[in-house]
């Protein structure tokens, strides 16, 4: 700030002092600040301490606070779907039907036309439309990973309902390590949580695109609604304009 | 806004406007709008109406944005902590120890002593103290719910480590439900997450507190740094304040 | 919260979410977005009185403190607090797009 | 981001976080608080300038209306972004308490 | 810095055939658009037609006095812009010139032209 | 088609004059309306785009107005280098439709 704005400086730079003095003494709802008359002397006791940085130090797994959006957020966002390969694909005999689990795979051909950088990438939903469910159901979803193993994504606690909902898992770290590899067909997994010592595992839950025997015309509108991948990215071209003036002001 | 304000208020309104109009065609990079020339006549496609609404509709599991703070976070929260309830207590006999589940129990005496009433906390995180790690291990949080069943709280993926680290998992819903019921002990539960197919459900992280034939000096470090619970409530004197000025602005 | 639900249905003269409903062919003169017609894009209006000075009577500064200047600003501002994305549906020649365009609704407003 | 990485190291002179570290004793005069003794609080300043005018060169004004005017104010304001929280220590009477307080310190800023 | 730079244009019979060349340099060609418009001697500017971007699927339209007779077509990989013309009349005798266009319903750059002159 | 008529035709005027050119569209074009300069033996030039907007690179001395069916193109100061022919375009429907051309001229 050029040099007849030093006062200035200094005039807010007094004005926030003192506005902290309010802010701290407000925030503790106190009028004035507390007698020191009592305090013991000495250190402060070691419990104290050790409370005082258990607050301070921040944790894994504790949420800090939300960081502030990239300058790439603030553009709008192009969004696309990529509906799940239909259920008669060969891919899906690979994978036994089993009772606690239904298999979902993506063409990944069609992810690249829609995103054809994997940085161009901003989010990534799962979505799924559930229909009516009697019980309370806990379920997790997965990735395929490699041949035959799965990787575990997030869960979700699913409450019992009498009309169809939909649901969203934000999938945008797998589909962008997709968008990086090679593969044709890349493929999520829903199950039921199992504990451990629990033997209950059916997933009871009914998704929509996976239920056979409909009639016709029924079909098509399940087709429709069958899980898809709502895709938000940022236009090719708006990216590369982007990439030109980030180190502009 | 007073009358002699309006002419304020529709200027101010003019100028929003004529921002809006900048920040739409800014955010799109467009340096003027598209022109119609070539839109197809008639109504918009099946398909893309159909992509509008999902992106329209916010569905269940998506984040919505942040809620903003409510006046209550405004004013200070006192710190408390809370530990676990030590492994030779006879509570820990009634679960017999296996090999993908810790157990983790607080007299909630202890914790309606820090927080006297339920809706003064405003977070509670349950804090363990992994030791070192040699592979990665998904475990799972669960509360003690009923008789002899555990209700999932929430999981966490635990990379290999070569030091101690402290974990957080935010309770704040859990303990506010211990202030309000009357028992004397509740519980967590740390288990191995356990897959349907799986069957390698031993839990390989060391917590410490946990670890038994200590010399008798390093116990104690160890019992320090056992699983607690940090508190942040409003102090109840402040919270009287706050009510009774709830209604005031 | 200074929110829809608070600011729309009272006379505050403070800082507030204030009404305000864009309809792009009329006030825009914009024909381009095919959906939607228009938003509640509203917007943040109302002073925040500096309240701390060393001579005020400080137990009435406290009780306004957090409202008019939480952020102990040396200039406090009335200004979004939460925002919400806005959908659109607009074409590029002959080809049809949807794009989200992120923080374009104010919901509630802060003095900050 | 217009946060303490950019702004403490650049001369900017628009909307920036600027560096203030709070000294309890010497700029407060308080002995009360007894852990931290001070801490960095930093503040916002710079103009946000209104660049939206239907005549100016529509290039240019794209270029920088995500910096200066994201949310589309009528009078944007330099305000905060990203904030923490400072835990304190300090004694009622004979007893020791560890408090929280919220939203102490500026780490970034925003045109709003 | 964008550059169109039209060639192909001479003297052709009636009812004769030639095509004309537009090399572009300075920007991502799959990008954009790309035009031609005419303008006769000592008369105004007339748009022919255009050939869309990638994302339009690279697909032309013209204007009604070109259609059927005039073709535009686009080389990526040479960064160039065609113009077939066929069955010419001497009302085509003009200055050929291959312009940018934008969305917004504009043409940003301009070539410097090509004359074509149809006489018997 | 739409139809675009300029006036007037040609116009002669000092430097350091201001001048105003007209176009006339046969309907309602939404502020489509574009601008070129045409000077002899050089390329055609866009000015203003989108019925105000300046190109980039072009002198502010050059701004455009109007709305519906009505526009204007000003030259707050006249300069020996205006001499030229301009063109106005409407971009709202196709085809793509210019006016017949203004030539401008140095008294």
């Known amino acids: 700030l050029s040099t007849c704005k030093t006062i200035d400086m200094e005039l807010v730079k007094r004005k926030r002092i003192e506005a902290i003095r309010g802010q701290i003494l407000s925030k503790l709802r106190l009028a004035s600040p507390p007698s020191q008359g009592e305090v013991p002397p000495g250190p402060l006791p070691e419990a104290v301490l050790a409370l005082y940085n258990s607050t301070r130090d921040r944790v894994a797994g504790e949420s800090a606070e939300p960081e502030p959006e990239p300058e790439a957020d603030y553009y709008a966002k192009e969004v696309t779907r990529v509906l799940m390969v239909e259920t008669h694909n060969e891919i899906y005999d690979k994978f036994k039907q089993s009772t606690h689990s239904i298999y979902m795979f993506f063409n990944t051909s069609e992810l690249r036309e829609a995103v054809p950088e994997p940085v161009l990438l901003s989010r990534a939903e799962l979505r799924l439309l559930r229909l009516k469910l009697k019980v309370e159901q806990h379920v997790e979803l997965y990735q395929k990973y490699s041949n035959n193993s799965w990787r575990y994504l997030s869960n979700r606690l699913l409450a019992p309902s009498d009309s169809p909902e939909w649901l969203s898992f934000d999938v945008t770290g797998v589909v962008r390590q997709w968008l990086s590899r090679g593969g044709e067909i890349e493929g999520f997994r829903l199950s039921a949580h199992c504990s451990c010592d629990s033997r209950d595992n059916t997933l009871q839950v009914d998704i929509n695109g996976f239920t056979t025997g409909r009639r016709g015309d029924l079909a098509t509108i399940h087709g429709m609604n069958r899980p898809f991948l709502l895709l938000m990215a940022t236009p090719l071209e708006r990216a590369q304009h982007l990439q030109s003036s980030r180190h502009r002001r | 806004l007073s009358t002699c304000k309006t002419i304020d208020m529709e200027l101010v309104k003019r100028k929003r406007i004529e921002a809006i109009r900048g920040q739409i065609l800014s955010k799109l990079r467009l340096a003027s709008p598209p022109s119609q020339g070539e839109v197809p006549p008639g109504p918009l496609p099946e398909a893309v109406l159909a992509l509008y609404n999902s992106t329209r509709d916010r569905v269940a599991g998506e984040s919505a944005e942040p809620e903003p703070e409510p006046e209550a976070d405004y004013y200070a929260k006192e710190v408390t902590r809370v530990l676990m309830v030590e492994t030779h207590n006879e509570i820990y006999d009634k679960f017999k120890q296996s090999t993908h589940s810790i157990y983790m129990f607080f007299n909630t005496s202890e914790l309606r002593e820090a927080v006297p009433e339920p809706v003064l906390l405003s977070r509670a995180e349950l804090r363990l103290l992994r030791l070192k790690l040699k592979v990665e291990q998904h475990v799972e949080l669960y509360q003690k719910y009923s008789n002899n069943s555990w209700r999932y709280l929430s999981n966490r993926l635990l990379a290999p480590s070569d030091s101690p680290e402290w974990l957080s998992f935010d309770v704040t819903g859990v303990v506010r439900q211990w202030l309000s019921r009357g028992g004397e002990i509740e519980g967590f539960r740390l288990s191995a997450h356990c897959s349907c197919d799986s069957r390698d459900n031993t839990l390989q992280v060391d917590i410490n507190g946990f670890t038994t034939g200590r010399r008798g000096d390093l116990a104690t470090i160890h019992g320090m740094n056992r699983p607690f619970l940090l508190l942040m409530a409003t102090p109840l004197e402040r919270a009287q304040h706050l009510q009774s000025s709830r209604h005031r602005r | 919260a200074l929110d829809t639900n608070y600011c729309f249905s009272s006379t505050e003269k403070n800082c507030c979410v204030r009404q305000l409903y864009i309809d792009f062919r009329k006030d825009l003169g914009w024909k381009w977005i095919h959906e939607p017609k228009g938003y509640h894009a509203n917007f943040c209006l109302g002073p925040c009185p500096y309240i701390w000075s060393l001579d005020t009577q400080y137990s009435k500064v406290l009780a306004l403190y957090n409202q008019h200047n939480p952020g102990a600003s040396a200039a406090p501002c009335c200004v979004p607090q939460a925002l919400e994305p806005l959908p659109i549906v607009y074409y590029v020649g002959r080809k049809p797009k949807v794009e989200q365009l992120s923080n374009m609704i104010v919901r509630s407003c802060k003095c900050s | 981001a217009l946060d303490t990485n950019y702004c403490f190291s650049s001369t900017e002179k628009n909307c920036c976080v600027r560096q203030l570290y709070i000294d309890f004793r010497k700029d407060l005069g308080w002995k009360w608080i007894h852990e931290p003794k001070g801490y960095h609080a930093n503040f916002c300043l710079g103009p946000c300038p209104y660049i939206w005018s239907l005549d100016t060169q529509y290039s240019k004004v794209l270029a920088l209306y995500n910096q200066h005017n994201p949310g589309a104010s009528a009078a944007p304001c330099c305000v905060p972004q990203a904030l923490e929280p400072l835990p304190i220590v300090y004694y009622v009477g004979r007893k020791p308490k560890v408090e929280q307080l919220s939203n102490m310190i500026v780490r970034s800023c925003k045109c709003s | 810095e964008v550059q169109l730079v039209e060639s192909g244009g001479g003297l052709v019979q009636p009812g004769g055939s030639l095509r004309l060349s537009c090399a572009a340099s300075?920007?991502?060609?799959?990008?954009?658009?790309m035009s031609w418009v005419r303008q006769a001697p000592g008369k105004g500017l007339e748009w022919l037609g255009f050939?869309?971007?990638?994302?339009?699927?690279?697909?032309?339209e013209y204007s009604a006095s070109v259609k059927g007779r005039f073709t535009i077509s686009r080389d990526n990989s040479q960064n160039s812009l065609y113009l077939q013309m066929n069955s010419l009349k001497t009302e085509d005798t003009a200055v050929y010139y291959c312009?940018?266009?934008?969305?917004?319903?504009?043409?940003?750059?301009w070539g410097q032209g090509t004359l074509l002159t149809v006489s018997s | 088609d739409i139809q675009m008529t300029q006036s007037p035709s040609s116009l002669s005027a000092s430097v350091g004059d201001r001048l105003t050119i007209s176009c006339r569209a046969s309907q309602d074009i939404s502020n489509y309306l574009n601008w070129y300069q045409q000077k002899p033996g050089k390329v055609v030039k866009l000015l203003i785009y989108y019925t105000s907007r300046l190109h980039s690179g072009v002198p502010s001395r050059f701004s455009g107005s109007g709305s519906g069916t009505d526009y204007t193109l000003t030259i707050s100061s006249l300069q020996p280098e205006d001499v030229a022919t301009y063109f106005c375009q409407q971009g709202d429907t196709l085809p793509w439709t210019f006016g017949q051309g203004t030539k401008l001229e140095i008294k």
């Open positions: 300075g920007f991502t060609f799959t990008d954009y658009y």
């Open positions: 050939i869309r971007n990638k994302p339009n699927g690279y697909t032309t």
């Open positions: 312009a940018r266009y934008t969305g917004g319903g504009y043409f940003d750059y």
